[in-house]
């Protein structure tokens, strides 16, 4: 061996390629006296021979697939044929050559896949075997798709894992497969040995028939549910179905209602759990989610729409216990007296809320019944027969029936007959002079009292006076309240006075009655009065254009990016200086002159969004008055958090010594937003030096399995570096340390002699 072909008798191992005709001896054993001859025993298979003089050779080609190791014994004999040395073990290891072709276990495979299945998720495996040594390229198989039929627009809908033979959909296949267009596909799959790398590799092919089945994970049609159902609840209203059994269903109420009256069972049937009330809520939108056994969403959520159908469960209601109208003595026939507006909570513009009005009684019936009529659908009351006389009947009471298609309600109307309105209001003063006020006079302050009188019947619409400012106050800073008993008008400040925009205002009042004047009488100068309001300057703080300013930026904006701006004006026209208050994270700066806000540090959505600071606007010069507004910066998520382990894994252990390779499962997470899809991490070892001892394989988007590749680990802790990539934009990778302890176990738990070590692992694998 190693170029030496002779030597003394001792244990030896030789490696010989299979399939090669013998071309040289294996070894020449030298006899030490008294030995003179040699004898060969063991797994010779009539191939291995030793000549009496100790020449070991083989007489025909070996076949590794028949026997990969020949265990032989060689003994040295003396002249009497007695063993004087040995027997010693001689091991012949047969080295593999590529003399076997791979063969598929089936000449035809059949499978099915649902439309919209997740790309990369295997739905079928093809399997081939090769008798050659799998530890060498000779037995390393490489699968590939030779052809896909039909091939639409040259797009591959299927892919195969070259090593495992797992067939799955491509991204295009997930999006485009449609059983209505093409319900079946055929793939021709090839397998090659030599890892597919050599021109001299052997190959085999198989056919795969694939049926595309409908994806039944679809939003159901909108549901209509009649309100106030008296049927026993819960009532099934619709259903969703995941494509495979075993999904866990749940409902998500995006509206966060205090009362969410729907549920879903583990079949995917959706129920309403209690009677609905359209008048409380007329429609619901919520989501159905299907999750796997790990609680990860299997697909996007489905939107469920429930419309609550109205029934006529509400009677009309009167606007008030008694509705009071006034009618003048001389009103003409057909004049409108007023409109009775009843309400119905049922659905608008339907028969359930469509109201009819009818007068059912008039009291007194003097001088006759039927003096009034009401428009059937509008509820407007009109004078029907003749002018009324106050001295005969000063008041009428009407009972009016208001009805929808099922309910009737009685409403009561009182009609007061009042004197004709033939007198106009007359101001006691036509000019109330000048009034000087500081611009910071409080809102609600009464600044002036005005008075007009009206000779018509007291406490009726003919004598009641309403004061209006008809000139000089286009901003609506002032208002007039009337005392109904005295008709006194109180001029009050409704909005802040402003020296800068209205230093002097010439105000004109008009006094009017709510009732119309009789024909031929008109308001004249006596019903008008004026006064002059002089506003004096007060140094005021700047005023922001908004109470809250809001801006939205991506959390990864470059330092120095403009993220928003605020504006304020000083009433006196002074320049303004802007500053920030409460920038606890030191993320922002503001341009003192323009109010533009810039980032000065990296922003982080995960630290909290929106980020709230106060902006301060201060007068430059003057008395340096300032005012404060809010600035809210909404941070949009970018993929800026590398994945990490979901929990503390310090307790992982294997019982030592390992009897067979073992594995353990770990979970990853990160702090970015994943919305409905959930994270899709990929896992790999952090260093090539770990590859001889460990293997990491993905279970799903968040979980992976770490397996040992051999059993020779010492009783100690090993730290395994694992890279976790989130596949985001940009992709981020976290490198995590998974500490794994190999320890002696007692009843499946790590055994440590007292005082030996702290931090005892607690999770056995």
């Amino acid at each position: 061996q190693e170029g030496k072909f002779s030597g003394p008798l001792k244990p030896m191992t030789f490696s010989i390629y299979e399939g090669q005709e013998p071309s040289q001896i294996i070894f020449q054993f030298k006899a030490n006296p008294p030995a003179v001859t040699f004898e060969l025993t063991g797994e010779t298979d009539n191939i291995f021979v030793i000549e009496r003089e100790g020449l070991l050779y083989y007489n025909r080609a070996l076949d590794r697939e028949t026997r990969s190791t020949h265990n032989l014994q060689v003994a040295a004999l003396d002249a009497n044929g007695i063993i004087v040395e040995g027997p010693v073990p001689i091991t012949i290891k047969v080295k593999d050559i590529n003399d076997n072709r791979p063969t598929f276990l089936q000449s035809k495979y059949e499978g099915s896949v649902r439309q919209n299945s997740r790309p990369g998720k295997p739905f079928l495996y093809v399997n081939a075997t090769d008798l050659d040594d799998p530890a060498t390229p000779n037995g390393q198989l490489y699968y590939q798709i030779v052809i896909q039929l039909p091939m639409i627009n040259n797009v591959m809908y299927f892919q195969i894992n070259n090593k495992t033979g797992a067939i799955s959909l491509t991204r295009e296949g997930s999006q485009e497969l449609n059983p209505a267009k093409n319900p079946s596909y055929n793939l021709v799959i090839s397998v090659k040995d030599m890892g597919g790398q050599s021109e001299n590799s052997f190959s085999d092919t198989t056919s795969v028939d694939i049926i595309v089945t409908e994806n039944i994970w679809k939003a159901p049609k909108p549901v209509e549910m009649v309100e106030n159902s008296t049927d026993p609840h819960p009532i099934k209203i619709t259903q969703v179905r995941w494509n495979d059994p075993g999904a866990q269903y749940s409902l998500v109420d995006k509206e966060k209602l205090p009362r969410f009256p729907f549920s879903i069972d583990q079949e995917g049937d959706i129920y309403v759990t209690q009677p609905l009330d359209r008048e409380e809520k007329d429609a619901y939108v919520f989501y159905a989610v299907a999750k796997d056994e790990y609680g990860k969403p299997l697909s996007y959520p489905l939107e469920i729409h429930v419309k609550v159908k109205d029934i006529n469960d509400n009677p009309p209601t009167c606007p008030s216990p008694v509705t009071v109208f006034e009618v003048q003595e001389n009103e003409r026939l057909g004049n409108s007296i007023g409109t009775l507006t009843a309400h119905d909570r049922d659905e608008e513009n339907t028969a359930n809320s469509f109201l009819n009005y009818r007068i059912v009684e008039q009291t007194p019936k003097l001088p006759m019944d039927g003096l009034f009529l009401i428009q059937t659908y509008a509820g407007m009351l009109q004078l029907a027969k003749q002018s009324l006389k106050k001295q005969d009947t000063p008041q009428y009471n009407l009972t009016i029936e208001v009805s929808d298609k099922d309910f009737k309600t009685l409403c009561f109307v009182q009609i007061n007959v009042i004197d004709i309105n033939d007198q106009i209001p007359i101001f006691e003063k036509s000019d109330y002079g000048n009034l000087t006020l500081a611009e910071d006079t409080n809102i609600g302050s009464t600044i002036l009292t005005i008075q007009a009188t009206d000779a018509d019947e007291p406490f009726t619409g003919s004598s009641k006076i309403l004061y209006h400012i008809i000139k000089g106050d286009s901003e609506g800073r002032l208002g007039v309240d009337t005392d109904p008993h005295t008709n006194t008008g109180y001029v009050i400040i409704k909005k802040p006075l402003d020296f800068e925009t209205a230093a002097v205002s010439n105000i004109v009042f008009k006094a009017e009655n709510p009732e119309p004047l009789v024909f031929g009488v008109k308001y004249n100068a006596s019903s008008f009065a004026k006064f002059t309001l002089i506003v004096t300057d007060v140094n005021e703080a700047p005023q922001f254009s908004q109470h809250v300013f809001q801006a939205k930026v991506s959390e990864d904006v470059a330092i120095g990016t403009k993220v928003g701006n605020v504006t304020a004006k000083d009433p006196e026209g002074l320049d303004i200086s802007y500053s920030l208050r409460g920038d606890t994270r030191g993320w922002l700066k503001i341009d003192h002159v323009t109010g533009e806000i810039f980032s000065v540090a990296p922003l982080d959505r995960e630290a909290g969004s929106p980020y709230r600071v106060q902006v301060v606007a201060t007068e430059v010069g003057g008395s340096s008055l300032s005012s404060v507004s809010e600035f809210h910066l909404i941070l949009m998520d970018v993929n800026d958090n590398p994945p990490r382990l979901a929990k503390d894994y310090t307790g992982l252990f294997f019982c030592h010594p390992l009897s067979a390779p073992g594995s353990l499962i770990f979970e990853a997470t990160d702090d970015d937003q994943h919305l409905f899809r959930g994270p899709h991490f990929t896992f790999s070892l952090g260093s090539g030096s770990l590859q001889n001892d460990w293997e990491v394989s993905k279970i799903n988007g968040t979980h992976a399995r770490l397996s040992t590749r051999h059993t020779e680990f010492e009783e100690r802790e090993y730290v395994v570096l694992i890279r976790i990539n989130d596949g985001g934009r940009p992709p981020l990778e976290g490198i995590v340390s998974l500490p794994v302890t190999f320890c002696s176990c007692v009843e499946g738990s790590c055994f440590r002699p007292a005082g030996h070590q702290t931090g005892i692992p607690t999770v056995g694998m």
């Epitope: 390229p137 090593k163 790398q197 790999s684 090539g688 030096s689 001889n692 001892d693 990539n725 990778e733």
Partner: antibody
């Protein structure tokens, strides 16, 4: 069987850069990390770094950071090591090796830096 | 980084002699992370022993390895002329991977 083919020699001038190649065959290239090792004449072995061909993630010996850059071309199953700002100290034999299974090394490329 | 100190640096031996080369590790490592390579002049290093004591394919049984923690050794039971080479220990426990400075074995 696994083979790692490297050019026999490269001659470059001081201050220049060189890109050494290592063509892999006999196994699936993206499965195992590729390592690079330096051996100065008459000296021992120094580990430069490793690269995962599946995603080009690399770990470097701190001593060679800035000097060596590891890359791969998956389509041709070839690993590369670029050495920059060359000096006579960089004259050495550079090996590519598969640490998986511990035993597969290229024949080495002899780099000579000389004006 | 982990430093591997080999001794002796050079040694000469006659055929049939027993050879022991030691490798001292600066901090304790698992035995599964210590490997031995043989390099003959003009050739690439060749794996001799992996995980402290496992013989690589095709390596004669006169070679053996042992050790744990910080102390490891390579033994040649009976030296043969073809064993003339430089022997390196190497650790794979921590990055950077490191090699011993080598032991040159010559024929006496």
């Amino acid at each position: 069987q696994v083979q790692l083919q490297q050019p026999g020699a490269e001659l470059v001038k001081p201050g220049a850069s060189v890109k050494l190649s290592c063509k892999a065959s006999g196994y699936t290239f993206t499965t195992y990390w590729m390592h690079w090792v330096k051996q100065r004449p008459g000296q021992g072995l120094e580990w430069i770094g490793e690269i995962d061909p599946s995603d080009s993630y690399a770990n470097y010996n701190q001593k060679f950071k800035g000097k060596a850059t590891l890359t791969v071309d998956k389509s041709s199953s070839t690993a590369y090591m670029q050495l920059s700002s060359l000096t006579s100290e960089d004259s050495a034999v550079y090996y590519c090796a598969l640490y998986y299974g511990y035993g597969d090394w290229g024949q080495g490329t002899t780099l000579t830096v000389s004006s | 980084e982990i430093v591997l100190t080999q001794s002796p640096t050079t040694m000469a031996a006659s055929p049939g002699e027993k050879i022991i080369i030691t490798c001292s590790v600066s901090s304790s490592i698992s035995s599964i992370h210590l490997h031995w390579y043989q390099q003959k002049p003009g050739f690439s290093p060749k794996l001799l022993i992996y995980r402290t004591s496992n013989l690589a394919s095709g390596v004669p049984t006169r070679f053996s390895g042992s050790g744990s923690g910080t102390s490891y050794s390579l033994t040649i039971g009976t030296m043969e002329a073809e064993d003339v080479a430089t022997y390196y220990c190497q650790q794979g426990s921590n990055l950077p991977l490191t090699f011993g400075a080598g032991t040159r074995l010559e024929l006496k």
